[in-house]
């Protein structure tokens, strides 16, 4: 049977699944999919890790703690109603038939408030950026302050650069993802 | 074998500050999340919060925000608790601790800590 | 946070007697759930983690079930050395948050 999570559009998700490392560097590879456990692997893969690191992920799913100390939650980034289902944990110890498997629901809410659509004249003024930081749980969101003004151009162009920069990978693999609003 | 040894008792005047150490010895910090722990006399335990030695990431309960600032130093293999703007109500023993990651396997002997005028 | 409800508080028991403590969490856990020992005077001692799984070393009379929010310590046959205060704690989110305690005394 699967346990339930909950989770509201826009927000970050956050599946829960650990496992104790036999000895500290001795990873286990381990799996995340969408839909429920099958008897072996995971259907769907949305993130896997290997012995040494994170192998492959999908865009919006990234371990939020340290795999490295079998920490292997999983944060779906700004999720949607799309989103909601069984996703499977799977732990892949060593052995016939030893995995730990961890089938998880999750229920994504509507949002509580839909804030009115932001005219163009909105961007143009100073505004804050949302940093939302590596965590343990439901993402923790503070301001940063004194940042520079920026215009709707400008945000246009940083968020491709974004998508393929370093910075997007330094972020991916800190766990953080910056918010713009 | 592991061990966890913390710096000994203090008592420090109200408004002052206090550092804790926690030497590890029998493993390395940076494998694991290090924790600290609040119990006052005859009460429960507390989770202040907790650092990943490897990046420095730390973590804290809300009531020890700005109270409680965990750091380590991995070439000595020792996490550090400092806490600030002591009251009376911070008189407590404080444990630090090693996590497995989700549950705490080994535990320092704790350090006394009195809060007096 | 999640909130950890331990009950009973306290509790009064003659050797030999089967003994269950409770812990509620306040939401969803799955089996993130570990239970300690703590005699009096000296530093918790894990017994239980992941719900269920007995730490290394610790006697087979202690034993732990329950997932999602009720879990459910349990001691088969109470010894003099298992005299302690016993807290449940939960590893899931941060914060990590502990019971309150439930304090096992000699009738």
């Known amino acids: 049977s699967e346990v339930e999570y909950r989770a509201e559009v826009g927000q970050n998700a956050y599946l829960p699944c650990f496992y104790t490392p036999a000895a500290p560097g001795n990873l286990v590879p381990v799996c995340w999919g969408k839909g429920a456990c099958p008897v072996f692997e995971c259907g769907n893969v949305v993130l896997r890790t290997d012995e040494r690191d994170v192998n492959y992920w999908t865009s919006r799913y990234w371990l939020n703690g340290d795999f490295r100390k079998g920490d292997v939650s999983l944060t779906i980034e700004n999720v949607t109603l799309a989103d909601s289902g069984i996703y499977c944990c799977r732990i892949q110890i060593p052995g016939i038939m030893n995995d730990e498997k961890f089938n998880l629901k999750l229920v994504i809410k509507p949002a509580k408030v839909t804030p009115a659509p932001t005219r163009q004249r909105d961007f143009t003024a100073a505004f804050p950026r949302m940093l939302t930081t590596r965590g343990h749980g439901p993402a923790e969101t503070q301001t940063l302050g004194s940042l520079p003004d920026i215009n709707l151009t400008q945000i246009s162009t940083l968020a491709n650069e974004l998508r393929d920069s370093r910075l997007a990978n330094d972020l991916r693999d800190s766990g953080a993802t910056i918010r713009i609003g | 074998e592991v061990q966890l040894q913390q710096s000994g008792a203090e008592l420090v005047k109200p408004g002052a500050s206090v550092k804790l150490s926690c030497t590890a010895s029998?493993?390395?910090?940076?494998?694991?999340?290090m924790h600290w722990v609040r119990q006052r006399t005859e009460q429960g335990l507390e989770w202040i919060g907790r650092?990943?030695?490897?990046?420095?990431?730390?973590k804290y309960a809300p009531k020890f925000q700005g109270k409680a600032t965990i750091t380590a130093a991995t070439s000595s293999n020792t996490p550090y608790l400092q806490l600030s703007g002591l009251t009376s109500e911070d008189t407590a023993v404080y444990y630090c601790?090693?996590?497995?990651?989700?549950?705490?396997?080994?535990w320092g002997q704790g350090t006394t800590l009195t809060v007096s005028s | 946070d999640i909130q950890m409800n331990q009950s009973p508080s306290s509790l009064s028991a003659s050797l030999g007697d089967r003994i269950t403590i409770n812990c509620h969490a306040s939401?969803?856990?799955?089996?993130?759930l570990s239970w300690y020992q703590q005699k009096p005077g000296n530093i918790p001692k894990l017994l239980i983690y992941?719900?269920?799984n007995l730490h290394t070393g610790v006697p087979s009379r202690f034993s732990g079930s329950g997932s999602v929010t009720v879990f459910t310590l349990t001691i088969s046959s109470l010894q003099p050395e298992d005299i302690a205060t016993y807290y449940c704690?939960?590893?899931?989110?941060?914060?990590?948050?502990f019971g309150g305690g439930t304090k096992l005394e000699i009738k």
């Open positions: 601790g090693r996590s497995n990651p989700y549950y705490f396997d080994y």
């Open positions: 029998g493993f390395n910090i940076k494998d694991y999340y």
């Open positions: 650092i990943d030695p490897e990046d420095g990431e730390t």
């Open positions: 939401q969803n856990i799955n089996v993130w």
């Open positions: 992941k719900a269920s």
């Open positions: 704690q939960q590893g899931q989110n941060y914060p990590y948050t």
